[in-house]
Interface confidence: medium
């Protein structure tokens, strides 16, 4: 008799794929544009990335460091009107893209939370949550919560408002902290809160260190849903050398939780390569004309247009991973088991019941390595086969779809492999 199927877990929309942050509308659209009407025209691009949610803004009125001139219910006219926002929501909904609004109050100022007037600001946030929920947003983000006194209790109250409106609404909190204990204390009092932090930001050194960080985090947070990013707002290139971008894309898309990216992460957008551009929000490179300041500074392979035409580009990899992440049960909500694969490597299995299973092997080092996969680390329910099919490699040149013998697995420097194999009873 066939074994009984495991009951599927309840899945919220943010469990089904990546979130895409557009913190600076002007930088994202470029060419002196940067409003809600223009963003609406970019939704097809977001659809092509298969992202599930757009984290937008902040876009509310905020005069730097002035509480009285900060109105969370009003859209800054530079970004457009409420009706432009409404129109964006409607278009996004038709494309199955959820919209999360960033309500970090003093986003133009020194202290995001006006440290001397916390209670006033907290009341404004409560009113804003009610208002924007009625207006149709799918969730909220608040950043820099390390600057918010009594953050845990405020977050719990805001979470109650958000979830009280609908279980389908999401609250994201962001912190610059990379300290696991601080992160856990924020999570403890807030069930269902999605927290973005700098926890993984110094993970780029070795596979062992990354494995240790990921497994510590997953063990400490138990079975709660988590998110994966390298910071609450910044680009991957702020933390990683170019050669590790593909590896991290593969890892973020295949760990159990919601991957969160900033605009430009999909093309390896790097402020350092664009003289004069701010580190936190460089102009998005749609094509070679997007950065006219220095002629010749931008080559086609740095742009959306150029990378869209190249199946071996970072953008093409992002799209493929995003597609897999949103449709494979084992990647959507499968169990996670990390195991030893040798020095410099991080490897893990994702599996769900009798569905196709996935093996991820990541080489963080700058030398080629043979993987010694220690299957003995794995529980019986997640045993390794002798061979697995190569779904994709972060490096060009591998023959995709071909079966690889796991005992003889060799990885190039900075290479990541995503392999698939069937469930075997």
């Amino acid at each position: 008799r066939a074994p009984r199927c495991r009951e599927l877990p309840a899945q919220k929309w943010w469990h089904t794929g990546a979130l895409y942050r557009i913190g600076d509308l002007q930088a994202f659209q470029g060419h002196g544009a940067g409003n809600l009407a223009g963003l609406k025209g970019r939704l097809d691009y977001l659809s092509s990335l298969k992202v599930k949610g757009l984290v937008l803004g902040p876009i509310h009125k905020n005069q730097k460091d002035d509480v009285a001139q900060t109105d969370l219910l009003q859209i800054d006219p530079n970004f457009g009107s409420k009706e432009d926002f409404d129109s964006l929501l409607q278009s996004a909904k038709k494309k199955s893209i959820r919209v999360i609004l960033d309500l970090t109050p003093n986003y133009r100022g020194e202290n995001s939370w006006f440290s001397t007037q916390v209670d006033t600001v907290a009341t404004k946030v409560k009113d804003a949550l009610e208002f924007w929920l009625q207006a149709g947003v799918d969730g909220f983000q608040v950043r820099d919560i390390e600057n918010l006194k009594d953050a845990s209790s405020f977050l719990a109250e805001w979470q109650n408002i958000t979830k009280g409106f609908s279980e389908d609404r999401l609250l994201i909190a962001g912190t610059n902290s990379s300290d696991l204990q601080q992160i856990l204390s924020l999570l403890e009092s807030n069930k269902d809160l999605l927290l973005t932090s700098s926890y993984l930001s110094d993970s780029g050194s070795t596979g062992e260190h990354t494995k240790s960080l990921v497994t510590q985090y997953l063990n400490a947070t138990g079975n709660r849903w988590c998110s994966w990013s390298l910071s609450q707002a910044r680009l991957l290139t702020s933390f990683l050398p170019a050669q590790l971008l593909r590896l991290y894309q593969l890892m973020l898309f295949t760990l159990p939780g919601t991957p969160v990216f900033s605009y430009g992460d999909e093309i390896g957008l790097d402020a350092a390569a664009l003289p004069g551009q701010p580190m936190e929000a460089p102009v998005m490179l749609w094509d070679e004309s997007s950065f006219p300041d220095i002629p010749g500074a931008v080559s086609a392979n740095m742009t959306v247009k150029g990378q869209s035409e190249d199946p071996g580009s970072l953008l093409s990899l992002f799209r493929r991973l995003s597609d897999q992440r949103s449709k494979e049960r084992s990647l959507l909500h499968g169990d996670f088991h990390a195991f030893s694969a040798g020095p410099g490597l991080f490897s893990y299995i994702r599996h769900w019941d009798q569905n196709e299973r996935f093996l991820v092997v990541l080489n963080f080092g700058d030398v080629g390595l043979s993987a010694g996969l220690q299957a003995s680390d794995l529980p019986a329910s997640a045993s390794l086969p002798a061979k697995a099919d190569l779904l994709l490699s972060t490096q060009p040149g591998r023959e995709e779809g071909s079966p690889l013998e796991l005992e003889r697995l060799k990885l190039e420097p900075h290479e990541g492999l995503l392999l698939r194999f069937p469930y075997a009873a």
Epitope: G80, S81, K82, E83, D84, D86, S87, A135
Partner: antibody, heavy 120, light 107 residues
Framework: QVQLQQSGAELAKPGASLKMSCKAS????????IHWVKQRPGQDLEWIGY????????DSNQKFKDKATLTADKSSNTAYMQLSSLTSEDSAVYYC?????????????WGQGTLVTVSA | DIQMTQTTSSLSASLGDRVTISCRAS??????LNWYQQKPDGTVKLLIY???RLHSGVPSRFSGSGSGADYSLTISNLQQEDIATYFC?????????FGGGTKLEIE
């Protein structure tokens, strides 16, 4: 409370032009588009187009592209629609309308209508 | 353009009756369907937006339902003040289009 006050009834000759107004009050004028809708006697409603008072951007029904010109004056919180080359087909009640901020393209607030009669 | 069809152009009912008015779109409009009431003096009011959401101030005897291309408005306990013409409107795609209207009368 939100109000849209339209100008009074107009009698015009064929071939002439006329300009009607819609004065908004009770909300921030630049936050919402002003839409215009036509209703001929005993007939259904037809959407003409809208203007974004903030940017003066307009979008209109192809059918009215050469007939209606939409403008707005931020200083007086007033939107205008000019109809040109009038014929008897333009005899109708014209409404201005505004959406609610709620998520859905519906017209929550309507003016009382301006009756236009085109007759020689 | 999307065509909106209200097959019943007029309808007679008694006070207290439950009345249903239907509306069909020429294609799937993803629930972006609104209902308006136009009184004999020309005043237009929004009743229902996004298929089933009641606009503020509208009595709960009005309700909406439907999906895809087929939608309906129901008045559960007809009152004298409900005598009016009812229009459906799609907000899915520009240009926005309205149905031909259903005139409700007391028999």
């Amino acid at each position: 409370q939100v109000q849209l006050q339209q100008s009074g009834a107009e009698l015009a000759k064929p071939g002439a032009s006329l300009k009607m107004s819609c004065k908004a009050s009770g909300y921030t004028f630049t936050d919402y588009y002003i839409h215009w809708v036509k209703q001929r006697p005993g007939q259904d409603l037809e959407w003409i187009g809208y203007i974004n008072p903030n940017s003066a951007y307009t979008d209109s029904n192809q059918k009215f592209k050469d007939k209606a010109t939409l403008t707005a004056d931020k200083s007086s919180n007033t939107a205008y629609m000019q109809l040109s080359s009038l014929t008897s087909e333009d005899s109708a009640v014209y409404y201005c309308a505004r959406k609610g901020h709620f998520y859905a393209p519906s017209f929550a607030y309507w003016g009382q209508g301006t009756l236009v009669t085109v007759s020689a | 353009d999307i065509q909106m069809t209200q097959t019943t152009s007029s309808l007679s009912a008694s006070l207290g009756d439950r009345v249903t008015i239907s509306c069909r779109a020429s294609q799937d409009i993803s629930n972006y369907l609104n209902w308006y009431q136009q009184k004999p003096d020309g005043t237009v009011k929004l009743l229902i937006y996004y298929t089933s959401r009641l606009h503020s101030g509208v009595p709960s005897r009005f309700s909406g339902s439907g999906s895809g291309a087929d939608y309906s408005l129901t008045i559960s306990n007809l009152q004298q003040e409900d005598i009016a013409t009812y229009f459906c409107q799609q907000g899915d795609t520009l240009p926005y289009t309205f149905g031909g209207g259903t005139k409700l009368e007391i028999e």
